[in-house]
């Protein structure tokens, strides 16, 4: 038994036929010693007397509000709730399994940007006697604060004969660092109470994995002269992180009729405009995704083909010029290599995802995970890799990125990736390895050697351990190169002479 909140206790029960239940001792919160009686809920039947009451809790009939009285006066209450465990698994009767992205997904969370603000939601068919309480933190062993509001009923839907209720909650990380590479996941815990049943649900994620931008805004069409094409332009959604030269999006533009089976025109672009073929009765739709990290696409923003206006919306990502940087010059050239680094880091992002796209859909946060990934260098809040830090002095950040590149380059060349089980012959790990080396060489200043971090002695003995470690390393690399790519994109846009 444990205390959920003041005067509310949860009794954990193994739930099987003829289970002995749990013996619970209740103590009346009073200085009185004599003449105390106990009742349950609205019943006036006296269950026992004395300052303590010992009960055997086996079923829901044994749970409820126990009250101690003296001479008709209420002294204190103790509400007992039951938490059922069947075959070693805690019950999940209150919430509905959303089955997306995988089975046993009861809580789903999304973030519109990297500000540390996110929304979680869950579904139930229960309409009354239902309460939720939400807690959250960053990390579990040394938790950092995340503040969550109250859960509210956000939608009601009819599903066949049943009504389905959606509840949601908004949370905000207390000291968010949008530009940093997350190393510890956000933990969300929901306590659900229906009548006398208690259940708890948890979710663990990085903000980067739950990013779903809002749809692009201000879609505008302009017919192109001497062509069947129209130019569609749009703008970044207001809710997306800024500056856009750092937090960049990529877009998918699609022209399609009302039916998904109809023919379509489709093009992907990093710009905020595209030329497409518009057909009568069709619509142009645009959606957005983080440019450097493959999280969710936004919903579509649409405009009918018939409404070809002439005004031009949308704006490029640009940014104002900043101070120069001591990034190594391109051999044989005189200007800093921000643009080259940008291209190579974007290639690294693509390779890191193609090296194992499935990694993104595997839940690898298992026991011992923190010790594995803690050995990996992360781009942290104080590393100067945020837009302001880059403007002030990009050297701190570039040195950190260089260390990370060397570290991952060594890891990818180590026994973890070269040992059994052999990598699939078409795995892009080789290309990834070469590109990491290429970018680290671009970054290394002339005649100056930054100190590099020691490679941890990660020597998995079993092939399955090696496989798991590969997944974890690639997953971590995806996050690292995304931050590096943002740094170089922003540098190319604002720090290049």
């Amino acid at each position: 038994i444990w205390e959920l909140k003041k005067d509310v206790y949860v009794v954990e029960l193994d739930w099987y036929p003829d289970a002995p239940g749990e013996m619970v001792v209740l103590t009346c919160d009073t200085p009185e010693e004599d003449g105390i009686t106990w009742t349950l809920d609205q019943s006036s039947e006296v269950l026992g007397s004395g300052k303590t009451l010992t009960i055997q809790v086996k079923e829901f009939g044994d749970a409820g509000q126990y009250t101690c009285h003296k001479g008709g006066e209420v002294l204190s209450h103790s509400l007992l709730l039951l938490h059922k465990k069947e075959d070693g698994i805690w019950s999940t009767d209150i919430l509905k399994d959303q089955k997306e992205p995988k089975n046993k997904t009861f809580l789903r969370c999304e973030a519109k940007n990297y500000s540390g603000r996110f929304t979680c939601w869950w579904l139930t068919t229960i309409s009354t006697d239902l309460t939720f309480s939400v807690k959250s933190s960053r990390g579990s062993s040394d938790p950092q604060g995340v503040t969550c509001g109250a859960a509210t009923l956000s939608a009601e839907r009819v599903r066949g004969d049943n009504k389905e209720y959606e509840y949601s909650v908004e949370c905000q990380e207390d000291s968010a660092c949008p530009a940093a590479e997350e190393s510890l996941p956000i933990e969300v815990m929901v306590d659900a109470v229906h009548k006398l049943k208690y259940e708890n649900y948890t979710s663990s994620f990085f903000i980067r994995d739950i990013i779903k931008p809002d749809p692009p805004k201000n879609l505008q069409l302009k017919p192109l002269k001497n062509s069947r094409q129209v130019e569609v332009s749009w703008e970044y959604p207001d809710t997306w992180s800024t500056p856009h030269s750092y937090f960049s999006l990529t877009f998918c533009v699609q022209v399609q009729g009302k039916s998904k089976r109809e023919k379509k025109d489709r093009v992907f672009t990093d710009k905020t405009s595209a030329a497409v073929i518009c057909r009568k009765n069709a619509s142009i739709s645009v959606r957005a995704q983080d440019r450097y990290y493959s999280s969710s696409w936004s919903e579509w923003a649409s405009v009918p083909c018939s409404g070809s206006g002439s005004s031009r919306g949308g704006s490029g990502s640009g940014g104002s010029g900043g101070g120069g940087s001591k990034l190594r010059a391109v051999p044989g050239g005189s200007s800093p290599a921000w643009t080259q680094c940008q291209q190579l880091s974007q290639k690294l992002c693509t390779l890191a995802w193609s090296a194992h796209p499935l990694v993104g859909h595997m839940d690898l946060r298992e026991e011992g995970d923190e010790e594995t990934t803690n050995d990996v260098p992360h781009i942290q809040c104080g590393d100067g890799c945020d837009p302001q830090g880059l403007r002030d002095n990009s050297q701190f950040c570039l040195q950190r990125i260089h260390q990370g590149l060397i570290f991952y380059e060594k890891l990818l060349g180590s026994d973890i990736f070269t040992g059994e089980p052999s990598l699939l012959p078409d795995s892009p790990v080789g290309q990834l390895h070469a590109s990491l080396l290429g970018l680290s060489q671009l970054l290394q200043p002339e005649g100056h050697h930054w100190e590099t971090q020691q490679i941890p002695s990660l020597s998995p003995s079993q092939p399955w351990q090696r496989l798991l470690l590969r997944f974890k390393i690639l997953r971590s690399l995806q996050a690292f190169v995304a931050v590096a790519a943002r740094v170089f994109a922003h540098g190319a846009a604002t720090l290049s002479p």
């Epitope: 069947r228 023919k263 489709r266 093009v267 990093d270 073929i277």
Partner: antibody, heavy 118, light 107 residues
Framework: QVQLVQSGAEVKKPGASVKVSCKAS????????LHWVRQAPGQGLEWMGW????????EYAPKFQGRVTMTTDTSTSTAYMELRSLRSDDTAVYYC???????????WGQGTMVTVSS | EIVMTQSPATLSVSPGERATLSCRAS??????LHWYQQKPGQAPRLLIY???QSISGIPARFSGSGSGTEFTLTISSLQSEDFAVYYC?????????FGGGTKVEIK
């Protein structure tokens, strides 16, 4: 399944015109875009243009603008590509292809060899 | 127009070996890049669309990667039926253009 059957080989004199046909089957003709791509002997592929059989809209590569006409006959599910003012360097295999997506080529015809020789 | 450059022009590989074909665009084309295979006397066949998306019916040994200006088609373990010419094609803007092709021949 979706199939495209093209007309037979042609031999033409310089300055003449050629009209190649492409008969579609296995799908609703107006549901797919139709493209024409050519390939000179021993050379690579060259896109000529597309037509939307639903409304007759076309877009031609600048290189062929004014010299090519693409048409369709929905009653017979057939597409046509006419190339005028033929030159010897128009000698090539001409392919029609169809796709629900406008910008790449999923289903190809078997090709029609057009030889331009005096 | 966007110029697509493929390299190498010819690639000599032994059966069972891995083949890596490159395609470079003259300007950034995001992932608007598609790969085709053509055997002598046959029409081309679509292998990969939008840089990395696989086509049902195409063996899993064919994979694509890349974005921006540099793209790669990888054939993990060459089978006898894979010796052919491979073309990349950009769909970023009209006119649609192809690379010059890479001939994969038996070593």
């Amino acid at each position: 399944q979706v199939q495209l059957v093209q007309s037979g080989a042609e031999v033409k004199k310089p300055g003449a015109s050629v009209k190649v046909s492409c008969k579609a089957s296995g799908y609703t003709f107006t549901d797919y875009y139709l493209h024409w791509v050519r390939q000179a002997p021993g050379q690579g592929l060259e896109w000529m243009g597309w037509i939307d059989p639903e409304n007759g809209d076309t877009e031609y590569a600048p290189k062929f603008q004014g010299r090519v006409t693409m048409t369709t006959d929905t009653s017979t599910s057939t597409a046509y590509m006419e190339l005028r003012s033929l030159r010897s360097d128009d000698t090539a295999v001409y392919y029609c292809n169809a796709n629900k997506e406008l910008r790449y080529f999923d289903v190809w015809g078997q090709g029609t060899m057009v030889t331009v020789s005096s | 127009e966007i110029v697509m450059t493929q390299s190498p022009a010819t690639l000599s590989v032994s059966p069972g070996e891995r083949a890596t074909l490159s395609c470079r665009a003259s300007q950034s084309i995001s992932i608007n890049l598609h790969w085709y295979q053509q055997k002598p006397g046959q029409a081309p066949r679509l292998l990969i669309y939008f840089a990395s998306q696989s086509i049902s019916g195409i063996p899993a040994r064919f994979s694509g990667s890349g974005s921006g200006t540099e793209f790669t088609l990888t054939i993990s373990s060459l089978q006898s039926e894979d010796f052919a010419v491979y073309y990349c094609q950009q769909s970023n803007s009209f006119p649609l253009t192809f690379g010059g092709g890479t001939k994969v021949e038996i070593k």
